[in-house]
């Protein structure tokens, strides 16, 4: 009886830990080639205002790769352009604006905003963005070439910031806080402009999440399992 109860407890712990591992949500956006992704990462707290911030892509099985970052310390409303990516940090409103202009099919992938806070791990701003770029123009006025042209009307003083050499293998992540949850974690909302064909779907990559869950929790489980077995071995 005692053994059964212990096993039940172990499985409950394991399942709850696994469920916690799947809390990482994504927002899926489908756009056409030539359109502009306009993302606002909401970091809320003043202590992050001058911290260096970055836009990263996460490829399966790889560490997050930084595509663009703000200066260090981050300058207020000062556009930083790296290729087709433009970052603007609005300190007073706690918003990092990321624009990817003239989207290409090969831009499809999983992205995230992070705040660098060395020596600590980078802080991820929710949610991750699953971008799917498809061929062909939408034919809607102002949704393709126009928006791209507008974005490039940026002063030539736009700078390219030097990003940190390291990219963390594991980004600190926390569930998006409710309005009154007292957390020192940023929350975020993602918005798109000049887009007619938008699909917002929370996506869970079951295979990756399950694998990740099992891998990250396996050590805890193994120890618990060993301890449990040892307690019953005469």
């Amino acid at each position: 009886m005692r053994k059964t109860r212990l096993w039940g407890l172990l499985w409950m712990l394991f399942v709850s830990e696994l469920r916690a591992a799947t809390k990482l949500t994504e927002e899926k956006y489908e756009l056409k080639e030539g359109q502009t992704l306009d993302v606002k990462c909401d970091y809320t707290l003043e202590k992050f205002a001058s911290s260096q911030k970055a836009w990263q892509i996460i490829r399966d099985g790889e560490m997050p790769k930084t595509l663009a970052c703000t200066e260090r310390p981050s300058k207020n409303s000062h556009p930083v352009q790296v290729g087709r990516i433009i970052l603007e940090d609005y300190h007073d409103h706690g918003l990092l604006r990321v624009r990817m202009v003239n989207l290409q099919v090969e831009d499809s992938g999983l992205y995230q905003c992070v705040i660098y806070q060395p020596p600590k791990e980078p802080h991820m701003l929710f949610d991750r963005i699953r971008l799917v770029v498809t061929k062909g123009f939408s034919g809607t006025p102002g949704s393709n070439e126009n928006s791209t042209q507008n974005v490039y009307k940026i002063p030539p003083t736009t700078t390219k910031a030097l990003c940190p050499l390291y990219t963390s293998p594991r980004t600190v992540t926390q569930a998006p806080p409710k309005s009154t949850a007292d957390v020192s974690t940023p929350d975020s909302e993602i918005n798109l402009t000049n887009v007619t064909d938008i699909i917002r779907v929370p996506v869970f990559n079951i295979v990756i999440l399950l694998a990740g869950g099992f891998l990250s929790k396996s050590l805890v489980f193994s120890v618990l399992f060993a301890v449990t077995l040892r307690s019953f071995v005469p």
């Epitope: 306009d38 606002k40 909401d42 809320t44 707290l45 003043e46 202590k47 205002a49 001058s50 609005y90 300190h91 007073d92 409103h93 706690g94 918003l95 604006r97 309005s179 009154t180 007292d182 020192s184 909302e189 918005n191 402009t193």
Partner: antibody, heavy 121, light 111 residues
Framework: EVQLVESGGGLVQPKGSLKLSCGAS????????MHWVRQAPGMALEWVAR??????????YYADSVKDRFTISRDDSQNMLYLQMNNLKTEDTAMYYC????????????WGQGTLVTVSA | DIVLTQSPASLAVSLGQRATISCRAS??????????LHWYQQKPGQPPKLLIY???NLESGIPARFSGSGSRTDFTLTINPVEADDVATYYC?????????FGGGTKLEIE
């Protein structure tokens, strides 16, 4: 649960001074901007002042109606917010609320119960 | 300063019906497409309580009968259906620019 408790209100004569205090607990006080909001009897809410965090050099902002008369300050080590009110006028009579927002220019999520200030001869 | 004008000043609605309160700003309260406009409920003798933040986000623990909409200068708070417990004064507030400002309030009564 976040708690904000105001004190220091009372009866004061016109042109007099009063200092309001607000004790904060159950949250990381030094992380958030803090505000004072007031409400005259039977009237609408009026934002009075805001003080930002150390990372913003404790920048302060005031409503025009109290500028140069009121001073907002904070003591992060004591989790305390203050409002020094000088040269008080009868129109400053109101319930004064200590308020915590949810971050930069965000909503007022937490309010104290208020402390009543009466300015009268 | 941004002036927020609420209408109507008072509103009488039957139980179970819809109540709609308007808040108009003298200039845009948006930064990008974020509206820094919030709604509060205040009952007599109590401090205000947050209902809706950033125009349309329902605060945790607030019934789904409350909803907010709008952007830039025109915003609406809707209560549907109205319940007896909703008798209170409702305020809009902007935090996009200093000084922060509140609307004049709308008193909701049951007819």
């Amino acid at each position: 649960e976040v708690q904000l408790v105001e004190s220091g209100g009372g009866l004061v004569q016109p042109k007099g001074s009063l200092k309001l205090s607000c004790g904060a607990s159950d949250f990381t006080f030094n992380t958030y901007a803090m505000h004072w909001v007031r409400q005259a009897p039977g009237m609408a809410l009026e934002w009075v002042a805001r003080i930002r965090t150390k990372s913003s050099n404790y920048a302060t902002y005031y409503a025009d109606s109290v500028k140069d008369r009121f001073t907002i300050s904070r003591d992060d080590s004591q989790n305390m917010l203050y409002l020094q009110m000088n040269n008080l006028k009868t129109e400053d009579t109101a319930m004064y609320y200590c308020v915590r927002d949810m971050g930069q220019r965000r909503q007022f999520a937490y309010w104290g119960q208020g402390t009543l200030v009466t300015v009268s001869a | 300063d941004i002036v927020l004008t609420q209408s109507p000043a008072s509103l009488a609605v039957s139980l179970g019906q819809r109540a709609t309160i308007s808040c108009r700003a003298s200039e845009s309260v948006d930064t990008f497409d974020y509206s820094f406009l919030h709604w509060y409920q205040q009952k007599p003798g109590q401090p205000p309580k947050l209902l809706i933040y950033r125009a349309s986000n329902l605060e945790s623990g607030i019934p789904a009968r409350f909803s907010g909409s709008g952007s830039r200068t025109d915003f609406t708070l809707t209560i549907n259906p109205v319940e007896a417990d909703d008798v209170a004064t409702y305020y809009c507030q902007q935090s996009n620019e200093d000084p922060y400002t509140f609307g004049g309030g709308t008193k909701l009564e049951i007819e």
